[in-house]
Interface confidence: low
């Protein structure tokens, strides 16, 4: 009863919002909702009435699963949808999904705060550029990860002649989509000219 | 007949706690959701909270989130409303109201009168 | 939110007259998802009508509702001697629930 499941769809696909357990026998009533109080659909044992909404034209409900089909998510449409069925005792069951729509993630600039040749050392401070988004980074040099401590959006490292590497590449992702950027630099402490 | 009876109310200092209670009975009490809404002194009326029938779900007004909690006794058809660090502003009748299909109130209680002052 | 003003603030009224009452909505209503409660004094309100032109059950034909989009009315076609009251509108188109200012129908 109540409970919440996540879901994670790239903008621009197509959905499905559907429960994980059969629907009630011979329940009397269906509605989808998003917020707590916002009708998307109801069915009422003999047709589905759609609501004015953001979603009109865009959602179709499958009486038989309960399924609500919406088409081309966008990140507006990130919510909390509801679907509370009415049993023949009058009782209530609902279930929630918590629909989270992302955009891809762009491809991402990589600009060099920092580049410092320090006795044979070098200096690194890269920063990896990405227009407002919650994402996640990983860093590679030689396309090799560095440790999992330096993953944030700065790469600042020493590095020793025998761990120069000469091309570093942040990679961006989020739970629908990935994006790589690269810089390379010419040993042992210059970048490289492009 | 459905029935909505509140008690609770009182007078309280600021700063202070009520708990209200809504006894229904003349319907099947679990399964509909069931809200509150008061009306301060010679004022009109603000939804303060929402419940779903099962309990699973619970809304509050800006006004009183964090302050108030909103929850329901399915077994002893009761709905309550537990109200902490009440304020001035809080002084109001609250009603509680049987919520038709998520849409608009009907019945209502009674009300209970709360009184928020030093 | 939606704001919904209602005019005017009181009508002093007899027993026998037509009374109509305006609720205007900040924003489009959807669905012509408002109600019309009836407040007494010292007694809580009274679904009157809802979806903006239907009659709760046990409510009188001479009440009657209209309106949509961001205007609606309620009208009352002979006033009797105990529809004198405080009436409130409320929209149920979108979160939060929200009433009108009411509007007090008095005797003259």
């Known amino acids: 009863q109540g409970h919440l499941v996540h879901m994670t769809v790239v903008s621009g696909s197509n959905v499905t919002l559907n429960i994980s357990e059969s629907l009630p026998e011979n329940y009397k009533q269906l509605t989808w909702f998003y917020t707590f109080d916002q009708k998307i659909v109801e069915w009422d044992s003999r047709k589905s009435k759609y609501f004015e909404s953001k979603f009109k034209g865009r959602v179709r409900l499958d009486p038989q699963s309960g399924a609500l089909y919406i088409s081309k998510v966008q990140k507006e449409d990130n919510s909390t949808y509801i679907m509370r069925v009415l049993k023949k005792t009058g009782n209530e069951q609902e279930w929630k999904i918590k629909l989270q729509v992302l955009d891809p993630v762009p491809k991402p600039v990589i600009k060099i705060e920092k580049i410092e040749d320090m006795d044979d050392n070098c200096y690194l401070k890269l920063s990896c550029v990405i227009p407002g988004e919650s994402v996640n980074y990983t860093w590679y040099g030689d396309k090799r990860p560095f440790p999992k401590e330096l993953q944030n959006s700065v790469l600042e490292t020493t590095l020793m002649p025998h761990n120069y590497s000469r091309c570093y590449t942040c990679q961006v992702s989020n739970s629908v989509s990935s994006k790589n950027g690269t810089v390379c630099l010419s040993p042992p402490c210059t970048l490289a000219r492009s | 007949e459905v029935q909505l009876l509140e008690s609770g109310g009182g007078l309280v200092h600021p700063g202070g706690s009520l708990r209200l209670s809504c006894a229904a009975s003349g319907f099947t009490f679990g399964g509909y959701a069931m809200s509150w809404v008061r009306q301060a002194p010679g004022k009109g009326l603000e939804w303060v909270s929402l419940?779903?029938?099962?309990?699973?779900?619970?809304y509050y007004a800006d006004s009183v989130k964090g302050r108030f909690t909103i929850f329901r006794d399915n077994s002893k058809n009761t709905l309550y409303l537990q109200m902490i660090s009440l304020r001035a502003e809080d002084s109001a009748v609250y009603y509680c109201?049987?919520?038709?299909?998520?849409?608009?109130?009907?019945?209502w209680g009674q009300g209970t009168l709360v009184t928020v002052s030093s | 939110e939606i704001v919904l003003t209602q005019s005017p603030g009181t009508l002093s009224l007899s027993p026998g007259e037509r009374v109509t009452l305006s609720c205007r909505a900040s924003q489009s209503v959807s669905s012509s998802y408002l109600a019309w409660y009836q407040q007494k004094p010292g007694q809580a309100p009274r679904l009157l009508i809802y979806g903006a032109s239907s009659r709760a059950t046990g409510i009188p034909d001479r009440f009657s509702g209209s309106g949509s989009g961001t205007d609606f009315t309620l009208t009352i076609s002979r006033l009797e001697p105990e529809d004198f009251a405080v009436y409130y509108c409320?929209?149920?188109?979108?979160?939060?629930?929200?009433f009108g200012q009411g509007t007090k129908v008095e005797i003259k």
């Open positions: 409320q929209q149920y188109g979108s979160s939060p629930r929200t």
């Open positions: 419940i779903s029938g099962s309990g699973g779900s619970t």
């Open positions: 109201a049987k919520y038709s299909n998520y849409d608009y109130f009907d019945p």
